[in-house]
């Protein structure tokens, strides 16, 4: 903590400007009024303060707002956000998407830090649900964001938000997460016609039950092997050879290359050899 010392004559800051970079830490502490800093936070990012100087500025804000910063200050924190701890952020009440975007921009290009994770958690909890605009914003900055949520957290995603989800946002989701997301996607896309529906639902099919896969097999969807490999084992096992052939269409030949991998291996094992032979792929049950 910076020692309390009187501000030297003529050094009292009238505004936040470039001259402050020449101030020693104790001078910043003594000569910069916290209330002035709070009202001119937007200027801080344009000034090349050292990390040590930023520590002083943070300390001044902490003293002014012991219960947590107001959103008017948070929105303009800029690089000072990187100095915040998760404990600091837990005191905040962030409601504006613009504030969230401004802070995510500071961390752009880096992995999600504990600070960012706490910020997002506070924001989403404040909103009560993960709405479409928020999801759009978060997945733009962190494509893996959705798959970092627990199944319980995903249950707060309204079906309307599913429209914001891109296939790459689901790349790292596990079966438990897709089990939650699939019914929401099914609901969100229910009014689309066959081929359009399949394009949209395809990324979510890792959560689909057997009945839905059987229904898709009747619609000439030509599912690719990459999608088939992501299906739930328990959903695939009851499918007949004829149903899998219809589901995959021309991609059925790809089963041979995946015969040693799950869930293809599990499915092959449970089929009658006579039925497998009809595929002409040399699959051994």
């Amino acid at each position: 903590e910076v020692e309390k010392t009187a501000c030297p004559s003529g050094k009292k800051a009238r505004e936040i400007d470039e001259s402050l970079i020449f101030y020693k830490k104790w001078e910043l502490e003594a000569c910069v009024d916290a209330a002035l800093l709070a009202t001119q936070m937007d200027r801080v990012n344009a000034i090349p303060f050292t990390y040590e100087q930023l520590d002083v500025l943070k300390h001044k804000l902490d003293e002014l707002y012991p219960q947590g910063y107001p959103e008017s200050v948070i929105q303009h924190l800029g690089y000072l956000f990187l100095k915040m701890s998760p404990e600091d952020i837990r005191k905040w009440n962030v409601t504006s998407l613009e504030t969230l975007k401004a802070l995510l921009e500071v961390n752009k290009g880096h992995e999600m830090s504990p600070q960012v994770a706490t910020l997002i958690d506070r924001f989403v909890k404040g909103r009560g649900q993960l709405d479409k605009d928020t999801l759009d914003t978060l997945t733009a900055f962190y494509p893996g964001y959705l798959c970092s949520l627990s199944p319980e957290e995903l249950s707060s995603v309204p079906p309307s938000s599913i429209w914001a989800v891109r296939p790459q946002d689901l790349d790292t989701c596990d079966p438990r997460q897709l089990d939650v997301l699939y019914p929401k996607a099914r609901l969100a896309f229910q009014n689309m016609n066959g081929s359009e529906y399949f394009v949209k639902i395809q990324s979510f099919l890792g959560g689909a039950p057997t009945e839905d896969l059987k229904a898709l097999s009747q619609q000439n969807v030509s599912m690719d092997l990459a999608t088939f490999m992501k299906l739930r084992t328990d959903a695939v096992l009851p499918l007949t050879v004829a149903e899998v052939q219809k589901l995959l269409g021309p991609h059925v030949e790809g089963l041979k290359a995946e015969e040693r991998h799950r869930p293809v291996r599990d499915w092959i094992l449970r089929q009658r050899q006579d039925d497998l032979d009809t595929l002409g792929l040399g699959l051994q049950g």
Epitope: D174, P175, R176, M229, T233, D234, L237, R260, H261, R262, R265, D266, L269, R270, Q284, G285
Partner: antibody, heavy 119, light 107 residues
Framework: QVQLQESGPGLVKPSETLSLTCTVS??????????WSWIRQPPGKGLEWIGY???????NYNPSLKSRVTISVDTSKNQFSLKLSSVTAADTAVYYC???????????WGQGTMVTVSS | DIQMTQSPSSLSASVGDRVTITCRAS??????VNWYQQKPGKAPKLLIY???SLQSGVPSRFSGSGSGTDFTLTISSLQPEDFATYYC?????????FGGGTKVEIK
């Protein structure tokens, strides 16, 4: 509740064939979702999967043991068996039989049987 | 075959500690990785399946995460009964393989 019990000789001579049987109780070896595996653990070492069988008779073996391993199933007795030929001292281990549920993993294990290869 | 490399091979920890064990697959195992606990003289016990699903009857202090090649088993607050050896295992490829094991000992 499904239980597994290994049985067989505890001592086998080098170059002979090791034979073990696993008896399934409280459930059926003919279950649709399950495969039945043999796994071994040499003293003080880690686990090594040997192979599995499905009730239809389809098998899948560890490539490093494939030439010496035969796993068979007897649905009428609710048993499956392991034969490992041309054994050496390196085959000395605790041998476990285990059920693998396709949706989970090796969720049920026998208590294991120690087999020593020595003359 | 897919090789499973576990680390550390052993660790010392105290009751109440948070313990993390990692397992790296030599090629993608998708999410088909399971975790087992084994105590001396006993058969292994399934803790986590499909990378992150908790096996029925297993305490919630155990959790798993990961996909592709990197997997983690976490014990949030180590209990006296948790001192044991832990193994990861992949079942994505038909040739199942186990990690070398991690022995968790009392500090």
């Amino acid at each position: 509740q499904v239980q597994l019990q290994e049985s067989g000789p505890g001592l086998v001579k080098p170059s002979e064939t090791l034979s073990l049987t696993c008896t399934v109780s409280g459930g059926s070896v003919s279950s649709f979702t399950d495969t039945w595996s043999w796994i071994r653990q040499p003293p003080g070492k880690g686990l090594e999967w040997i192979g599995y069988i499905y009730y239809s008779g389809s098998t899948n073996y560890n490539p490093s043991l494939k030439s010496r391993v035969t796993i068979s199933v007897d649905t009428s007795k609710n048993q499956f068996s392991l034969k490992l030929s041309s054994v050496t001292a390196a085959d000395t281990a605790v041998y476990y039989c285990a059920r693998e549920d396709a949706l989970t993993g090796f969720d049920i294990w026998g208590q294991g049987t120690m087999v020593t290869v020595s003359s | 075959d897919i090789q499973m490399t576990q680390s550390p091979s052993s660790l010392s920890a105290s009751v109440g500690d948070r313990v993390t064990i990692t397992c790296r697959a030599s090629q993608s195992s998708r999410y088909y990785v399971n975790w087992y606990q084994q105590k001396p003289g006993k058969a292994p016990k399934l803790l986590i399946y499909a990378a992150s699903s908790l096996q029925s009857g297993v305490p919630s202090r155990f959790s798993g995460s990961g996909s592709g090649t990197d997997f983690t088993l976490t014990i949030s607050s180590l209990q006296p009964e948790d001192f044991a050896t832990y193994y990861c295992q992949q079942s994505y490829d038909a040739s199942y393989t186990f990690g070398g094991g991690t022995k968790v000992e009392i500090k």
